[in-house]
Amino acid sequence: MSAKSRTIGIIGAPFSKGQPRGGVEEGPTVLRKAGLLEKLKEQECDVKDYGDLPFADIPNDSPFQIVKNPRSVGKASEQLAGKVAEVKKNGRISLVLGGDHSLAIGSISGHARVHPDLGVIWVDAHTDINTPLTTTSGNLHGQPVSFLLKELKGKIPDVPGFSWVTPCISAKDIVYIGLRDVDPGEHYILKTLGIKYFSMTEVDRLGIGKVMEETLSYLLGRKKRPIHLSFDVDGLDPSFTPATGTPVVGGLTYREGLYITEEIYKTGLLSGLDIMEVNPSLGKTPEEVTRTVNTAVAITLACFGLAREGNHKPIDYLNPPK
Amino acid sequence: MSAKSRTIGIIGAPFSKGQPRGGVEEGPTVLRKAGLLEKLKEQECDVKDYGDLPFADIPNDSPFQIVKNPRSVGKASEQLAGKVAEVKKNGRISLVLGGDHSLAIGSISGHARVHPDLGVIWVDAHTDINTPLTTTSGNLHGQPVSFLLKELKGKIPDVPGFSWVTPCISAKDIVYIGLRDVDPGEHYILKTLGIKYFSMTEVDRLGIGKVMEETLSYLLGRKKRPIHLSFDVDGLDPSFTPATGTPVVGGLTYREGLYITEEIYKTGLLSGLDIMEVNPSLGKTPEEVTRTVNTAVAITLACFGLAREGNHKPIDYLNPPK
Amino acid sequence: MSAKSRTIGIIGAPFSKGQPRGGVEEGPTVLRKAGLLEKLKEQECDVKDYGDLPFADIPNDSPFQIVKNPRSVGKASEQLAGKVAEVKKNGRISLVLGGDHSLAIGSISGHARVHPDLGVIWVDAHTDINTPLTTTSGNLHGQPVSFLLKELKGKIPDVPGFSWVTPCISAKDIVYIGLRDVDPGEHYILKTLGIKYFSMTEVDRLGIGKVMEETLSYLLGRKKRPIHLSFDVDGLDPSFTPATGTPVVGGLTYREGLYITEEIYKTGLLSGLDIMEVNPSLGKTPEEVTRTVNTAVAITLACFGLAREGNHKPIDYLNPPK
């Protein structure tokens, strides 16, 4: 694999207003405290830390219809988009540490500014494809994909804070893995737009090996292109990542999470990564928090080359230099 | 299956000096206390108990370079080799209850004295293939395979206590299953020697059914031969075998462990078995200890014919004799 | 899928005398309390509640040989058979909430009165195929299949309470999934009669996708016919359904349980369903009880169309009517 696959720009995105639970803004902090950067460097990654984005508080951010905190969410993603684009222009893989999943609007938009041909793999229990009109919760972390899809352009009203957004991916450019809690409106969109998805049903039917084979063939079969992996830790089973906002039983195993990310690494095409929705406030015990964080760290390390079969540098270990 | 597949010689190997944690020498005791012998007899096995080997304390066993307790480890395996060879000459399947995995040097060496054409299946989170020169820990339970492989003959220095060892298997005679924590030097050896392995990545990709099909075809496809299964309980996920010295998350499930052993039994070729690294002192609670021990017992019973689909003797259960 | 697949008649069967543990008679109550009916209605099911069957106490119900409570068990199943037949004549899918698995004698008998060509999928850790003569426990919840099979007609003695029973299915009409604790006599019957089964060994070998493909092809390949799913919650791993009478480690996962039921729903042929052996008295903690009940509810909802990929009604969610 080229060194490019291990050249990273880390962006902390301590933001929580796309959903109602406090604590997810601490995600970047706990991931850093768990030694993420040190571990990446240990596995021969070239890591540049772009720090945590300073998200200013926006007063009077009243709802748009039932959509909550629209200006805060829109502005946060706008900031993030700029920073991700900067990282990409610097030739690094962007690693966004969330924060809630509404930030994917910014992360993918920024990525697409530099690599408009990117393909997205979205690992999540949820499709996050509600529009501001189909949402029943009003939480924007359940809506990012609707803002990003060209096919939904006419279906997104003018939400304050989002005027900067231009849809940048087509329905054929995204693959979902791990779905198991999908709203009726979201399901309608999924089927109507013919989006490729592997819900937990397909994962059970095919096995994760075939799922990844089909995913990568679907996105890369015709032409190699940059991959953006947006990983919500709730895609994994709550037994592995309990400290998250919307856990759903019956998720991907720790092993399946690692397999997905190992396979993506092996393409050599990973170009942007989001690690989202770690919320240390939602662990019932300190152990639940560390379990969640350690799992998120392991997933990240696999994205950047750590392999369960082992790794070695190109030297002769049996005849070390005198 | 012939009665030979259920004719067993049990050897307790209460030894712990291949690693730093006290308690693994109690492995044979807790496995016996859990009723292992009684359960084997209940499933129609012909069990001969050769007792626990008496490992004398060796004073002044100073390190060789960084390799710890070399004389103790070497002597223990030498004793075990003799006892395993005796069991094999008696026409029994050797069942070694460890004790730490350094003992596999003795178990496989003794087995190979009587069956030099044996093939090895090594179930473990680790390759245990460090040489005394590549090891960073100095613990010999991480090195047994390096002593056994003919291809590494020139790479093993003269470690005190090991002058009796003659490498007895080729790189093509071993298959690993369950790997997920492999040192760089070990990975180098794995790839350089072209050793067949199924890390957890391959298990996830292929499923355990295909893994076992490929394993048995690889070892037995050209010619039937005796199988030595060396089973480190850390090959299984720590949720099933927590009371062990080097647990690694993301391991084989209880079900996968049973599948591996059921399939090996069904070949009719199991000739030697090691059940290693049960350490009752490392259970956080007594329940963790019994969970580990019960799992190890279940794995062992499957090696000797206990099947999840059920078993019956060759009698008519619907028309029992009057 | 036609509306028929979501037209349900619910029968509570609060009965426990097919086994020794009190509490399983509370199964219908806890399943109802968990909101099962409301949830079914929420997913567009047409639900008719036939209430709980009133099982009168039968005095002097002395054992037949070692078979316990024969008159009580026989009478309960006789009552249930009548009620299931009524539900089927009303054009509804019968949903029996157990209660212990001896009730399947009644549930399947009643179903077969109206649909004599039915095929049975039996999800269970156990075959429940002991005859009154092969049983060692005497508990009738381990015997229902022996009463139902035509091939065993001559092997079933005249047990008081069962004179009404006529075997209604052939050995070729049933498929087992999840087996892992099978008595020798039961195994003999399984093999002698050539019954199709997927023990946990086969599930591990093939994966649940292939298991369901083969199951449905076996039962429906030549001719479409009604399916009766008899689901013992002990078929699932005790980590998901601990509050049950005879838990056995190494069971089907929550995901596999959902996959089985989703696939059965998708045939459009589900005609009868039993949800059996939920015993709230056997949860070690309140959480164990709710975990069991929630799992049983999820399994049931999947039988009637709830899909992990999502569901939507045939309306346009993006252009809702003004």
Epitope: - | K33, P280, T290 | D181, G245
Partner: antibody
Framework: EVQLQQSGPVLVKPGASVKMSCKAS????????MNWVKQSHGRSLEWIGV????????TYNQKFKGKATLTVDKSSSTAYMELNSLTSEDSAVYYC?????????WGQGTTLTVSS | NIVLTQSPATLSVTPGDSVSLSCRAS??????LHWYQQKSHESPRLLIK???QSISGIPSRFSGSGSGTDFTLSINSVETEDFGMYFC?????????FGGGTKLEIK
């Protein structure tokens, strides 16, 4: 021969707590697990819980969680059980017993009487 | 919890008789069943482990059998010192549980 010597009989008032001991000798204390068993009015036996003297890890019968607390003092090879919020239902003989699967060695028992 | 049911509750015999005591488990427990004897004002003592395995120091007239759910303790030619309570205990799962006991008394 393994010896498990238990503390003497106790009479306490309802609502009080009591701590009984079990001193082990003639074997390595940390090598075996110590269980506690309750016997009410000379008949039924109930397993309370078990402790690992090696690391203090415990597994309890859910029924006795909150009622019994098991501890050990490695230095004196002694196991302890504390029972709290005592009622007449807790009046019984309590045995310390070793090991993990079957119980080969039993203490002589401590009689607890709870009475006002 | 696994329930162990012992029968009969009381057994009256004459020295020299042979007797069988039953212990039935509420679910299959393989051979994870052990038998104890308790004489009046004494602690229980282990007689049989794993359904049928004898314990050193225990007279050979005591034997055990069974597997799964049904277990039997047999005493071949009862002696006067054998009178007392007999308990079975399972080690198949937590919590460990005992049967209610069978009282062996002189007829």
């Amino acid at each position: 021969e393994v010896q498990l010597q238990q503390s003497g009989p106790v009479l306490v008032k309802p609502g009080a707590s009591v701590k009984m001991s079990c001193k082990a000798s003639e074997y390595t204390f940390t090598d075996y697990y110590m269980n506690w068993v309750k016997q009410s009015h000379g008949r039924s036996l109930e397993w309370i819980g078990v402790i690992s003297p090696y690391n203090g890890g415990t597994t309890y019968n859910q029924k006795f969680k909150g009622k019994a607390t098991l501890t050990v003092d490695k230095s004196s090879s002694t196991a302890y059980m504390e029972l709290n919020s005592l009622t007449s239902e807790d009046s019984a003989v309590y045995y310390c017993v070793y090991d993990l699967y079957y119980f080969d060695y039993w203490g002589q028992g401590t009689t607890l009487t709870v009475s006002s | 919890n696994i329930v162990l049911t012992q029968s009969p509750a009381t057994l009256s015999v004459t020295p020299g008789d042979s007797v069988s005591l039953s212990c039935r488990a509420s679910q299959r427990i393989s051979n994870d069943l052990h038998w104890y004897q308790q004489k009046s004002h004494e602690s229980p003592r282990l007689l049989i482990k794993y359904a049928s395995q004898s314990i050193s120091g225990i007279p050979s007239r005591f034997s055990g059998s069974g597997s799964g759910t049904d277990f039997t303790l047999s005493i071949n030619s009862v002696e006067t010192e054998d009178f007392g309570m007999y308990f079975c205990q399972q080690s198949n799962s937590w919590p460990r549980t005992f049967g209610g006991g069978t009282k062996l008394e002189i007829k």
